[in-house]
Amino acid sequence: AAPCPDACCPHGSSGLRCTRDGALDSLHHLPGAENLTELYIENQQHLQHLELRDLRGLGELRNLTIVKSGLRFVAPDAFHFTPRLSRLNLSFNALESLSWKTVQGLSLQELVLSGNPLHCSCALRWLQRWEEEGLGGVPEQKLQCHGQGPLAHMPNASCGVPTLKVQVPNASVDVGDDVLLRCQVEGRGLEQAGWILTELEQSATVMKSGGLPSLGLTLANVTSDLNRKNVTCWAENDVGRAEVSVQVNVSFPASVQLHTAVEMHHWCIPFSVDGQPAPSLRWLFNGSVLNETSFIFTEFLEPAANETVRHGCLRLNQPTHVNNGNYTLLAANPFGQASASIMAAFMDNPFEFNPEDPIPVSFSPVDTNSTSGDPVEKKDETPFGVSVAVG
């Protein structure tokens, strides 16, 4: 094949090599950029900056090599449009530093920085940590700081991410209240800070105030939906990013719902309870306190992380006619109490008719399915029961 006369020439099916001396001063308008997976650049003394716009449209890029060139600055967001980048070789350039933000969000298997006049400072603490932890092939490069010795020996005692303290109200917060949160930020070289409020949605009206080092946030007219929602304060400096999340507990009274008993391998009287603080629960059976045993007990479903409502079952293992009756769930917290009742009829007396027993309700036989937590059963009989849809 004839030699390629252009500044950049195809290499393989999805690669590009740019090695003609001094032909590039930016990476705009590279041919076939959208399909490139590999880009090799060498001997480009005029290529001094790598910025966000330079790599726009290189979404498939996996390997980027810029070596023996004049690169002095890589923008913190330079690789925003190349999320698949896994190998980055920037050796033998003029880089004095590289921000932690540059590689944040990438899954770099390899990062090569040897041959750069690195300047040891807290801004390279992240790279020192990669070296300590054996990440990205960094330890093998034995990186040196220009005139300062090995990167590994750089003092780092003062190189910390910002320290955050979020003050939340001590007093009980009620529905409709306004809540003031304050985030105190401490640390060296503070760059940016703010609030992440993505979970709040309609939980409150939000007003931000202040700036570094003290950020204010007013949550006005809060609703009970604010419970279990994260309010996050963040701050960044040249070392890294810190986040602290808090939750505001909004008090509201207990509430309870009961649903018709359903038969699985065992029986379940489904319930939902809500309230902040979480309500205490008590079951009554025909008006008397129900003592929970391995045959009848409260079983909670796994709670959703971002809501206060709890769902569960009063679980009954192989109930008989003596378990037919009125079930009441009482829920109480300091702000109120609630109750709900339901009649449940599991079966006729399977043993005999006894005049002293309550008169049972008759149901048609149904089949059942097995679920975990009970012996795996060999079936050769049809138990009594009732199949009910929960509406």
Epitope: T293, S294, Q318, H321, V322, P375
Partner: antibody, heavy 115, light 108 residues
Framework: EVQLQESGPGLVKPSGTLSLTCAVS?????????WTWVRQPPGKGLEWIGE???????NYNPSLKSRVTISVDKSKNQFSLKLSSVTAADTAVYYC????????WGQGTLVTVSS | SSELTQDPAVSVALGQTVRITCQGG??????ASWYQQKPGQAPVLVIY???KRPSGIPDRFSGSSSGNTASLTITGAQAEDEADYYC???????????FGGGTKLTVL
Amino acid sequence: EVQLQESGPGLVKPSGTLSLTCAVSGGSISSSNWWTWVRQPPGKGLEWIGEIYHRGNRNYNPSLKSRVTISVDKSKNQFSLKLSSVTAADTAVYYCARAPWFDYWGQGTLVTVSS
Amino acid sequence: SSELTQDPAVSVALGQTVRITCQGGSLRSYYASWYQQKPGQAPVLVIYGKNKRPSGIPDRFSGSSSGNTASLTITGAQAEDEADYYCNSQASSGNHLIFGGGTKLTVL
């Protein structure tokens, strides 16, 4: 498959406290099951001691209630039995099992009460 | 009463049917479970609930109940069925469990 393994001293002095632990493997002690202790004196029948749920609910045999404590340690996936003021009549093989059906049992551990 | 009563010993000819019974007031209200125990071993659940058999238990084992009596029936007893059999159920209060005294089954 769920497995249970009892452990603890095989010899306890009269008036002392018997302490046993049951390690649960192959399943979580925080599942929808209760866990129970049963004992069997040499040459005699089975006696239910008590049961516990991971949320802390407990029930005890009325005849032993004043001397029995059953507790659960979710972090270690195990539950324990303490029986105080023991006498020779408490000499038995002690079993742990999964309630309510006792469908899984430990192999049992003999505890002798003797000075 | 919080008691379950079993016959101390029962025998059966090989291949024949045998019924082991368990009596108690709580059996009017609750199902019995049945356990097989061989010497030096932990008990094994054979029947629970309304004639339910755990996986691995042969179908010659079945359970039934009438009045204050629960029964374990072995249809076509085998030599390996020789063991002690215990019933249990909830006590009448429903708040604790009780065992029968056990029945020693001999297969002749």
